[in-house]
């Protein structure tokens, strides 16, 4: 069966300077390939976090993704600023051998609404 990516919250509100968690779970780790978080869609989308080892300031994974059979790819964004407002998507990719990774499924998105402190 096809992998499903679930983002349970349609939206979260967070005060500027605080932290927020964006939840994402998958039903399967197959096909092999990374999970990435983006803000926005289409041409304007921005890579926010990738579960592939790179360092992303202010963002870290919530659960231990090195553990076998971990299906939780939630992230925590610290010290949220108004520029962080937008819709965040958790996206599952299939690893390509020589060609680029292929996007195969996405969560429904979580809107982050930043409140003035």
């Amino acid at each position: 069966t096809e992998v499903k990516v679930t983002q349970p919250e349609k939206s979260v509100s967070v005060a500027a300077g605080d932290s927020t968690i964006l939840n994402c779970t998958v039903t399967s780790l197959l096909p092999v390939g990374p999970i990435r978080w983006y803000r926005g869609v289409g041409q304007s989308r921005l890579l926010i976090y990738s579960f592939t080892g790179e360092h992303f300031p202010r963002i870290r994974n919530v659960s231990d993704t090195t553990k076998r059979n971990n299906m939780d790819f939630s992230i925590r964004i610290s010290n949220v600023t108004p520029e962080d407002a937008g819709t965040y998507y958790c996206v599952k990719f299939q690893r390509g051998s020589s060609e680029p990774d292929t996007e195969i499924q996405s969560g429904g998105g979580t809107e982050v609404y930043v409140l003035a402190k």
Epitope: K10, S11, S13, V41, S106, G108, G109, E111, Y113, L115
Partner: antibody, heavy 119, light 108 residues
Framework: DVQLVESGGGVVRPGESLRLSCAAS????????MNWVRQAPGEGLEWVSL????????YYADSVKGRFTISRDNSKNTLYLQMNSLRAEDTAVYYC????????????WGLGTLVTVSS | ETVLTQSPGTLTLSPGERATLTCRAS??????LAWYQEKPGQAPRLLIY???SRATGIPDRFSGSGSGTEFTLTISSLQSEDFAVYYC??????????FGGGTKVEIK
């Protein structure tokens, strides 16, 4: 049973204002995001505005931004749309629509109220 | 914003025939697509969500399929009450939430 009943439509001149209401019953109103969707005569459906259950999150279509204001009174189970600086192209049936609790599609709709903007 | 294009604009069929309506998205919306039925003087009614899941109380002659950019609503055997206008709506890229232009299914 979910019920959404719109009111407040009517005939106005360009530049005038109107306030639409949507009385909701049959569900926990404050737990659901609500929307206004309109349909101009002979045209398709056009999303107008969205407000979250708490009223914190609000979005508008570009075509109404700066002129329309969405609001809600959870104590009265009522959704509102304040329409200012009305134009002929705002002529439409305005529907109140309840969002699904997980995704942004519409589980339930009202019958709509007709707004006619004409000189 | 994601643009949805529905085809055909009008479908003229007889009761008992099969109706196939298409909705194309300008970019992938995965399976975040809903279908609605609208009849004059009535509230629009949710038929399908998640591209293929039937809403509560919708008869099984209605089925949805597709993912990514291409979607289909099929009415397996048209009943007299199915002659109406049908709209698709994406809820992946939002806001704005966008609808297709509609397909009118009329009686031959």
């Amino acid at each position: 049973d979910v019920q959404l009943v719109e009111s407040g439509g009517g005939v106005v001149r360009p530049g005038e204002s109107l306030r639409l209401s949507c009385a909701a019953s049959g569900f926990t109103f404050s737990s659901y995001d609500m929307n206004w969707v309109r349909q101009a005569p002979g045209e398709g459906l056009e999303w107008v505005s969205l407000i979250s259950g708490s009223g914190e999150i609000i979005y508008y279509a570009d075509s109404v931004k700066g002129r329309f204001t969405i609001s809600r009174d959870n104590s009265k189970n009522t959704l509102y749309l304040q329409m200012n600086s009305l134009r002929a192209e705002d002529t439409a049936v305005y529907y109140c629509a309840k969002e699904n609790n997980r995704y942004r599609f519409f589980d339930d709709w009202g019958l709509g109220t007709l707004v006619t903007v004409s000189s | 914003e994601t643009v949805l294009t529905q085809s055909p604009g009008t479908l003229t069929l007889s009761p008992g025939e099969r109706a196939t309506l298409t909705c194309r998205a300008s970019q992938s919306v995965y399976t975040y697509l809903a279908w609605y039925q609208e009849k004059p003087g009535q509230a629009p009614r949710l038929l399908i969500y998640g591209a293929s899941s039937r809403a509560t109380g919708i008869p099984d002659r209605f089925s949805g399929s597709g993912s990514g950019t291409e979607f289909t609503l099929t009415i397996s055997s048209l009943q007299s009450e199915d002659f109406a206008v049908y709209y698709c709506q994406q809820y992946y890229d939002r806001p704005p939430l966008t609808f297709g232009g509609g397909t009118k299914v009329e009686i031959k």
